[in-house]
């Protein structure tokens, strides 16, 4: 049987059953979340769950810039540090730059330190790149 | 095709104010933040306002904050600029314009509408 | 005064390569921020000539070219024809700003 891999929307990429979107230009962490609802699907900010889809994505946004950081779907509503994806996933793999937690800072990013693979948390009302996720 | 169309411009006197209007069509209007650009006579492009595809998130220049609001009718496929407390310095033709999904570039405008404020 | 300055006029003759600057500063252009190049004939609309600093949209004859590098972009435009005597803009983003975007004050090329 041929297996046809699922289409994204046009300019975001596929891997491992999912479809992303970067997002190259500058909103608000809950800007940003509308903007990837906006594309139906269930698409939300993007939630992050291993290392290899980490990896992925750190790779792909290497390709076009590499100093700026990028808003994902990890944030902390209640700002009591207990953090969760806004997808739903479950917050199991976790990848914090270590620095940078506390404060009035209760969304993630990708940071450009160490390639888009470790996360700080910054003030949701920065305007930043983001990234989108959905599951075609 | 698409197609931005503005309308509305006119000559005012300072203090008056003036709505500009867009229609919008060929595209999923809904989908797409829109910017309001101004060119004053003999200068360049001037960035005046922008408002998000849903038009709950709206962006203005320095210029205009607290004088004009960006507006959208979805359901209309139109563009609103309100434009309060005229200037002389406000004197320009307005452009509308589409901004890309994904990236800042504003890949569709209108020809634009004169705004002449004058006494 | 806008933070991304370009020459005021530039000029070639037709078939001539013709380059315009777009000099920024590490609040913008070299922030990784992208780079954007517009076509203005007066009386008409704007028109999108190249985007993300290198690309092109479709139906942009590939006499059109953008580059960055650091803190400055620039236009090419080769085989320099009648028709593209018009004003061109660079616009960015401007992370020192409250705006939203910033255009270049514009570069008048006359074709000689």
């Known amino acids: 049987d041929i297996i046809m891999r699922p289409s994204c929307a046009p300019g975001w990429f596929y891997h491992k059953s999912n479809c992303y979107g970067y997002f190259r230009k500058l909103r608000n962490w809950s800007d940003a979340e509308l903007e990837c609802q906006s594309y139906g699907n269930g698409a939300h900010l993007a939630s992050i769950l291993s290392l290899k889809e980490a990896s992925t994505i750190a790779e792909y946004i290497s390709g076009y810039q590499r100093s700026q950081p990028i808003w994902i779907g990890l944030h902390d509503p209640q700002k009591r540090q207990q953090w969760q994806w806004i997808d739903g996933a479950m917050y199991l793999y976790r990848s914090w730059s270590g620095k940078s937690m506390g404060g009035n800072k209760h969304c993630a990013e990708m940071s450009s330190n160490n390639n888009f693979l470790t996360w700080s948390s910054n003030e949701c009302n920065k305007r930043q790149h983001f990234l989108c996720k959905y599951r075609p | 095709e698409v197609q931005l169309l503005e309308s509305g411009g006119d000559l005012v006197q300072p203090g008056g104010s003036l709505r500009l209007s867009c229609a919008a069509s060929?595209?999923?209007?809904?989908?797409?933040?829109m910017s309001w650009v101004r060119q004053a006579p003999g200068k360049g492009l001037e960035w005046v306002s922008a408002i998000s595809g849903s038009g709950g998130s709206t962006y203005y220049a320095d210029s205009v904050k607290g004088r004009f609001t960006i507006s959208r009718d979805n359901s209309k496929n139109t563009l609103y600029l309100q434009m309060n407390s005229l200037r002389a310095e406000d004197t320009a033709v307005y452009y509308c314009?589409?901004?890309?999904?994904?990236?800042?570039?504003?890949?569709?405008w209108g020809r634009g509408t004169l705004v002449t404020v004058s006494s | 005064q806008s933070v991304l300055t370009q020459p005021p006029s530039v000029s070639g003759a037709p078939g001539q390569r013709v380059t315009i600057s777009c000099t920024g500063s590490?609040?913008?252009?070299?922030?990784?921020?992208?780079v954007h190049w517009y076509q203005h004939h007066p009386g008409t609309a704007p028109r999108l000539l190249i985007y993300d600093n290198t690309n092109r949209p479709s139906g942009v004859p590939d006499r059109f070219s953008g580059s960055k590098s650091g803190t400055s972009a620039s236009l090419t435009i080769t085989g320099l024809q009648a028709e593209d005597e018009a004003d061109y803009y660079c616009q960015s983003y401007d992370a020192s700003l409250s705006g939203y975007v910033v255009f270049g004050g514009g570069t008048k090329l006359t074709v000689l």
């Open positions: 060929g595209f999923t209007f809904s989908s797409y933040a």
């Open positions: 590490s609040s913008n252009i070299g922030a990784d921020y992208d």
């Open positions: 314009a589409r901004e890309d999904r994904m990236r800042t570039q504003l890949d569709s």
